[in-house]
Interface confidence: medium
Amino acid sequence: QQQTLPKPFIWAEPHFMVPKEKQVTICCQGNYGAVEYQLHFEGSLFAVDRPKPPERINKVQFYIPDMNSRMAGQYSCIYRVGELWSEPSNLLDLVVTEMYDTPTLSVHPGPEVISGEKVTFYCRLDTATSMFLLLKEGRSSHVQRGYGKVQAEFPLGPVTTAHRGTYRCFGSYNNHAWSFPSEPVKLLVTGDIENTSLAPEDPTFPADTWGTYLLTTETGLQKDHALWDHTAQNLLR
């Protein structure tokens, strides 16, 4: 006899990286017939929703109107059908960005290289942080961590055309509080396509849409929450 229900999916809309003072919605998708959903934050009960009518609804939304560092952290959700509770969802790391300062991102030897050459990104921030994150915009969320007193280096090693794209970095004051994003650096790599079918190029975005760029990063994001769940839970591990 089944003692628990399958775990729900959890994700953030429009994005799990939320600029300070902006709004975000945490979504939890369970099963039709669920009479109660609970959202947990850092291990404690944070909010409860009871959908009406439960047999017609399989998703609830928890709205955060004004993101700040106290709201940043790890969220999970569970749901109940009758007296039976589900397994908890995977953890969603909700990050607040645009905190304090803006790092500077540079690339060596330069923004244009030939395939096979070694490339290193440098992210510099003079305020008190020792962790840095390098993100490549586009279809998949490539995130690297780096450490250093005021600067971290991110060696990409010998690059291929797969490294083409637009990069930004953040300083991280803790796992869930990040700086403003750096200005973008576009890396252009001259070389051969690795596979016979060239994937469409990663889209690039102007600075003012950075806060929503990951909306397009996972294929079928709105339909396949498992993908999003994975991205969110793996990003900060």
Partner: antibody, heavy 118, light 107 residues
Framework: QVQLQQSGAELVRPGTSVKVSCKAS????????IDWVKQRPGQGLEWIGV????????KYNEKFQGKATLTADKSSSTAYMQLSSLTSEDSAVYFC???????????WGQGTLVTVSA | DIQMTQSPSSLSASLGERVSLTCRAS??????LNWLQQEPDGTIKRLIY???SLDSGVPKRFSGSRSGSDYSLTISSLESEDFVDYYC?????????FGGGTKLEIK
Amino acid sequence: QVQLQQSGAELVRPGTSVKVSCKASGYPFTSYLIDWVKQRPGQGLEWIGVINPGSGGTKYNEKFQGKATLTADKSSSTAYMQLSSLTSEDSAVYFCARGGWDGKFTYWGQGTLVTVSA
Amino acid sequence: DIQMTQSPSSLSASLGERVSLTCRASQDIGSSLNWLQQEPDGTIKRLIYATSSLDSGVPKRFSGSRSGSDYSLTISSLESEDFVDYYCLQYASSPYTFGGGTKLEIK
């Protein structure tokens, strides 16, 4: 503003070699690749190869491997293309070009006419 | 190597007319395509990059688009200085390759 100033026209003998220069100004020379392109009289364009002035790294179109040698001198912000064992097939206008944040071949030199004739 | 087949090779048109030039790529090149303009004195200028983005200073009558493996340059209303040569160029994969060119002549 970005400028690529190429050396003047050359009249050379078959079997010899020639070195075409492309002097860059208006930007940090080592930050952008320089591509070279060939255009035979009344014909289309062919990509010869590319050099990274910062590292000296090169990549060639196989068709021009052994024919063209690309180098760069950081101190003078100049890229060079040497063509060896010249034949009449090498008579052409040669262009250098530079990319930008927005992709390849953003800026072009004015072209250098190389004529191979006995 | 990726082949770029450009058509037509020459085109006669009148001032004010709308014209389109096409390049077909033999393999998928994504959006890595430029359109170049070459003056009679040999000067080359990039008009369009990344398939559809207009270079700064290029008149708005020029536009680029894509349908599958076909890439188009459209001039909405021809002006006298537009009657020159045009080339497409793919920079998705080396060796980079050019279309054969289109000579645009005044009718």
